[in-house]
């Protein structure tokens, strides 16, 4: 049988090393060889490259190699498949050596800032050594901060034949770190030179972007003073790198700039021991270049009432994500901030949080939680100045079973009952969160049976027990990933009950 | 339509010069390598020179190698064969001729007879 | 450096089928493409084979290209003979050692 006719032919000329082609089917049946016809200088020369019918057979791949390779040129190629009942050709296909060239990537030397030119890195690279002197070269810049997986790129040419080339890149952020590489191509060509070595460049320092802030309102102390925790970070958006020296606050009651008090830090929180009035406190860093612009925030009095609009909340899992949806009754609230923590017994050593704007949901990657660990999540409407009712929810990320099962006891033994109470595990023990608890219980060298019963049940009466028995009887606190057994207790019921008994001594 | 129309031939004397002209039309000259093809009365056709696109590169039949030259004007749309020293052996019609895209000729011109006697 | 080699002529009569060939003498003829040409007397040639057996869309489908590698030769063949089809036949390639093309010796058709 006759080979299939080769088809797919796609050609690639790579620039003065060589021209070549590829075509399907990549294997036969049968044992087949090719030969690859081409013209060349616009069709007056006419010559074959040939798959070698001895170690290359069924290789669906040509090349022709200088000195025959012109540039720039027309070729045609045409590929005969050839086996021992005869040959078929392809169709005549036609290449624009300008349009398939390929040349090697250049070569960036340096990435700069230019003193006193914001915002702006100064690439420099050599165009690369095997490029068409006179064609005009089309480049890609990627262009990525150091901590970001996310390219972003710009395209431009260049038409001077110049060794060193530049291209500034604006519109960048201050004090940042960023990985540039450059490709290019001649103009015409569909192909790309691969991507360069990768280089990195620093923008200019400026003065700091701006701050977050955020407040922890705590309960009055027995003096009327009400302890405050503000806190901040850098705002979105601002450079990784940028360093403040320090911070500038200054507070003051409502209407009264004149009780204005001030305090400079180097931390990102401070604590303020405000009165029971409206406050305004005001925040900005700094460093050697300037301030930053002012955060402002109202503490509200005491006695203010405020508003609340989330109606409810739910927080879910995604492979990778928590989500946390909640649903608003103020559809003119577009600005919320979410707090969470671990919700441990003692005070939480990490307090996290975060504004976000025109949505009404937050996510968060799930490799930033503790997995096996319970999270506070709080979520405050903010309408202009003022901050609304929290709405909380608890999630887990990850749930496990739990590290101990419940501490039991066995109270009230009858004749045929008994009243079994355990305690609640530990939150640092629960893992997730507990979905009900199952008593097992058995006679000795009897059937073991097992009652269920709901989270908030902590104590249960087991009925129908067989008087002057031995029991042996554990409690199991499950989650969602499964359950863990208490401490195994003993108990015997008694041969009749003390009610009479005591009736009995009396006679 | 294409069209290839050859000028300049006639009768010369053996050792004495003549430059032969073909005027281009209805095609982009500048993308095509150029020929000249001739044919001694009664025989077959004989190649005698072809020329790159942009003029750069000429290649010759022996026998007129070092004697003939051809050269082509892109602006002008025309192709040319100077022919020095000639002989009797180049008495013949001179077509001027087109290389195609796949290693033919496409087109011809009518042809332009050269005498070279005494 | 090779010669084509035609035979100086061929015959037939009406609507019957000729094949003329085209022998290379050195190296294999399907290192390089063939083209014919039609020349009739006193006129220009005409292209109606290229590329070994491509046909120009202006010429009739009774003309037709081949390659035989074991003959290693080249051939025209021409079907339905037609009056009109009398006329010389040359055969040409591309010879990279002279670095030019090379024309067959010419072959003339008779229609009986």
């Known amino acids: 049988v006759l080979p299939a006719k080769p088809e797919n032919i796609s050609c690639i000329f790579y620039y003065e090393e060589n021209f070549t082609c590829t075509w399907s089917p990549e294997k036969e049946a049968s044992y087949t060889w090719y030969k690859v016809k081409r013209t060349y200088s616009y069709g007056y020369k006419s010559d074959i490259c040939s798959t070698d019918n001895s170690t290359r057979g069924n290789h669906a791949s040509c090349s022709f190699l200088p000195p025959t390779i012109t540039n720039p040129d027309n070729y045609t190629i045409q590929v005969e498949a050839q086996n021992a009942d005869g040959i078929m050709k392809s169709d005549i296909t036609y290449w624009n050596l300008d349009a398939i060239m390929k040349i090697e990537p250049p070569e960036i030397f340096s990435v700069k800032s230019v003193l006193g030119i914001k915002r702006m890195l100064q690439i420099k690279w050599i165009r690369p050594v095997l490029a068409p002197h006179s064609s005009t070269l089309k480049y890609t810049l990627r262009f990525r901060t150091i901590n970001s997986a996310y390219w972003m790129e710009v395209n431009f040419t260049k038409e001077d034949i110049d060794r060193d080339e530049t291209y500034n890149l604006t519109e960048l952020q201050a004090f940042t770190e960023y990985v540039m590489t450059l490709r290019c191509a001649p103009a015409e060509s569909m192909f790309w030179s691969g991507w360069s070595q990768e280089k990195v460049g620093t923008t200019e320092e400026e003065a700091p972007y701006g701050l977050d802030l955020w407040r922890v309102l705590k309960p009055a102390m027995v003096d009327g003073r009400r302890p405050v925790q503000l806190m901040w970070k850098k705002a979105t958006g601002a450079p990784v790198l940028e360093k403040a020296l320090g911070y500038n606050i200054w507070y003051f009651p409502e209407n009264n700039t004149n009780l204005t008090e001030t305090v400079n830090t180097t931390n990102q929180t401070h604590e303020l021991y405000l009165g029971g009035k409206t406050y305004w406190v005001y925040v900005v860093s700094y460093n050697s270049l300037g301030e930053s612009p002012v955060a402002t925030l109202r503490i509200p009095a005491l006695n203010e009432k405020t508003f609340q609009c989330i109606e409810a909340m739910q927080a879910c899992l995604t492979q990778d994500q928590l989500v946390v949806e909640w649903q608003s009754s103020a559809p003119e609230v577009d600005t919320w901030m979410v707090e969470w923590f671990p919700d441990v017994d003692s005070e939480p050593s990490s307090f996290s949080w975060e504004s976000v704007s025109q949505a009404r949901n937050w996510t968060i990657q799930k490799d930033e939680l503790k997995p096996l660990w319970c999270y506070n999540i709080s979520v405050y409407p903010v309408l202009r100045d003022r901050v609304g009712q929290p709405y909380s929810t608890q999630a887990y990320v990850q749930e496990g079973i739990p590290s101990a099962g419940p501490v039991t006891q066995a109270d009230s033994i009858g004749v045929k009952t008994v009243t079994i109470t355990w305690k609640e595990i530990p939150k640092s023990k629960r893992n997730g969160f507990i979905k009900n608890y199952t008593i097992f219980y058995q006679a000795e060298d009897g059937k073991e049976f097992s009652k269920t019963v709901n989270s908030n049940i902590l104590q249960y009466r087991l009925e129908s027990l067989t008087r002057r028995t031995s029991y042996s009887l554990q409690v199991m606190a499950s989650t969602n990933a499964g359950g863990t057994n208490g401490t195994k207790i003993n108990f015997k019921t008694l041969s009749i009950s003390h009610h009479h008994h005591h009736h009995h001594h009396h006679h | 339509e294409v069209q290839l129309v050859e000028s300049g031939g006639g009768l010369v004397q053996p050792g004495r010069s003549m430059k032969l002209s073909c005027a281009a039309l209805?095609?982009?000259?500048?993308?095509?390598?150029m020929a000249w093809v001739r044919q001694a009365p009664t025989k077959g056709l004989e190649w005698v020179a072809s020329?790159?696109?942009?003029?750069?590169?000429?290649y010759y039949r022996d026998s007129v190698k070092g004697r003939f030259t051809i050269s082509r004007d892109n602006a002008k749309n025309t192709l040319y064969l100077q022919m020095d020293s000639l002989r009797s052996e180049d008495t013949a019609t001179y077509y001027c001729a087109r290389h195609g895209t796949i290693a033919a000729m496409d087109y011809w011109g009518q042809g332009v007879m050269v005498t070279v006697s005494s | 450096q090779f010669t084509l080699t035609q035979p100086k002529s061929v015959s037939g009569s009406l609507r019957s089928t000729i094949t003329i060939p085209c022998e290379r003498n050195?190296?294999?003829?399907?290192?390089?493409?063939v083209s014919w040409y039609q020349q009739h007397l006193g006129r220009p040639p005409i292209i109606v084979i290229y590329a070994d057996d491509q046909r120009p869309s202006e010429v009739s489908d009774r003309f037709s290209g081949s390659i035989d590698s074991s003959s290693n030769s080249a051939s025209l063949t021409i079907t339905n003979l037609q009056m009109d089809d009398e006329a010389d036949y040359f055969c040409?390639?591309?010879?990279?050692?002279?670095?030019?093309?090379?024309f067959g010796g010419g072959t003339k058709l008779t229609v009986l």
């Open positions: 209805g095609f982009t000259f500048s993308n095509y390598y």
């Open positions: 020329i790159s696109t942009g003029g750069g590169n000429t």
């Open positions: 050195n190296g294999d003829i399907g290192d390089s493409y």
């Open positions: 040409q390639s591309y010879d990279s050692n002279i670095d030019g093309p090379v």
